[in-house]
């Protein structure tokens, strides 16, 4: 039952997209006082596993040692303290990257963009798809996602972006999935470096910020959650 | 519910100024370029200046070019334009309105009036 | 700068009835083309972007179709709330152009 105590946090290392076959540790970080971790899976008996905590008991490991398409899902962990069971904590999304064939990206019309114009990377598939992702390198969150209308099985998404700036370029890739399941990605497509030269008007200094590319709103950030963070891509559904 | 909000017009003189603001809310406005696009009388749309979402990067329609200045305070979710040396011709309904990072504008104000007459 | 010539500029039509606008742009705008509409003393509104996708709460009786120079906007079924001027504008390339209207009417 869920108390007044405080929420873990629940965390991937080395992080959260994790490729066929590697080992992954998922960390739930609670109180000094937590006697017991829970974490519990989307779509699975509860709990999904329990760990003792390791000293000095503020958090606990559970380990994945090769990343299968069983592992890929949403997670929530909880811990308990002498006076019962915490809040969940925010849910962690576990992506497996590998499941399917590798998509390609290219930008229309050049992967050479002036500012204040405008380009459209594509993502085609070799096999229909529903979901294409695109991520930009080094973008604080970098997924971004765009579904196919209806459901229906597509071979390609286009992601446009204008006015581009400076800050768009980068280094692209992107990623097809079916959309019964999310956690489930192909292969990464091979990168794409869009270059953007010098501004048509008023270039000022870049701040040091991470900002938006493609098919979302400019600069808006997405969560593989949805949510809106403060920064990076925004996810994009069609 | 993403709100955009214009004050600031009125009447002036040719030649003088005048200086508009958005007021934004229902988004995190630090995230989004932002654009002004006037509506002279009975006339269609015509786009103004852009700003990118940190101000990084700014541009202007050629016919305001030098006399406009479009800014942003992320801090007080509020956008700007300061138009100086007033003509006639910018006689016009000013919207501000959000970019959606596609080409287009996906939110827009209601609107301030700015009348420029002798 | 891009050039956007809409037609009709005016149009009167029945509800019920299916209409169609067309923009043409000067030079290839690829699909940056949007479509907005206008009620008397009201700010527009986005209804189409990127030529064909659906702006968030649009009645999916408004659809657009092009690529290049020639797109074309259409209303499958007229309601009488569909009464407004409709706009086109390429998003191609700053400066950001808009067509010159077209105002919808009842027969």
């Known amino acids: 039952q869920a108390g007044p105590l405080p929420k873990p946090t629940l965390w991937a290392e080395p992080g959260s997209v994790i490729s066929w076959g590697n080992s992954v540790t998922i960390w739930c970080q609670g109180t000094l006082e937590a006697r017991e971790y829970r974490l519990d899976k989307e779509e699975s008996p509860a709990p999904w596993d329990r760990q003792n905590p390791l000293e000095p008991k503020n958090k606990a490991r559970f380990s994945i040692p090769s990343m299968t398409e069983d592992y890929a899902g949403r997670y929530r962990c909880y811990y308990r303290s002498p006076v019962g069971w915490s809040q969940p904590s925010d849910p962690l999304e576990l992506v497996m990257t590998g499941a399917y064939s590798k998509p390609t990206l290219s930008a229309l019309p050049s992967p050479l963009v002036t500012s204040g114009k405008s380009v459209t990377l594509l993502c085609q598939s070799r096999s229909p798809m529903d979901t294409f992702l695109l991520i930009k390198e080094r973008a604080a969150h970098p997924l971004l996602h765009l579904r196919s209308e209806h459901g229906a099985q597509q071979h390609q998404a286009e992601f446009p972006m204008s006015p581009v700036t400076s800050v768009h370029g980068g280094t692209y890739r992107c990623f097809s999935s079916h959309g019964f399941s999310h956690y489930l990605l192909s292969h990464p497509s091979d990168p794409l470096e869009l270059i953007v030269s010098g501004s048509l008007e008023d270039p000022r200094p870049s701040p040091t910020r991470s900002v938006s590319t493609a098919a979302g709103p400019e600069d808006q950030p997405l969560m593989p959650t949805g949510s809106v963070p403060h920064s990076g891509l925004r996810r994009h559904w069609e | 519910e993403v709100q955009l909000v214009e004050s600031g017009g009125g009447l002036v003189q040719p030649g003088g100024s005048l200086r508009l603001s958005c007021a934004a809310s229902?988004?995190?406005?630090?995230?989004?370029?932002m654009h002004w696009v006037r509506q002279a009388p009975g006339k269609g749309l015509e786009w103004v200046a852009y700003i990118f979402s940190g101000s990084s990067t700014i541009y202007y329609a050629d016919t305001v070019k030098g006399r406009f200045t479009i800014s942003r305070d992320n801090a007080k979710n509020s956008l700007y334009l300061q138009m100086n040396s007033l003509r006639a011709e910018d006689t016009a309904v000013y919207y501000c309105?959000?970019?959606?990072?596609?080409?287009?504008?996906?939110?827009w104000g209601q609107g301030t009036t700015v009348t420029v007459s002798s | 700068d891009i050039q956007m010539t809409q037609s009709p500029s005016s149009l009167s039509a029945s509800v019920g009835d299916r209409v169609t606008i067309t923009c043409r742009a000067s030079q290839d705008i690829s699909k940056f083309l949007n479509w907005y509409q206008q009620k008397p003393g009201k700010a527009p509104k986005l209804l189409i972007y990127y030529t064909s996708r659906l702006h968030s709460g649009v009645p999916s009786r408004f659809s657009g179709s092009g690529s290049g120079t020639d797109f074309t906007f259409t209303i499958s079924s007229l309601q009488p709330e569909d009464i407004a001027t409709y706009f086109c504008?390429?998003?191609?390339?700053?400066?950001?152009?808009f067509g010159g209207g077209t105002k919808l009417e009842i027969k």
């Open positions: 229902g988004f995190t406005f630090s995230d989004y370029g």
């Open positions: 504008q390429q998003g191609n390339t700053l400066p950001w152009t």
């Open positions: 309105a959000r970019a959606d990072g596609r080409g287009a504008m996906d939110y």
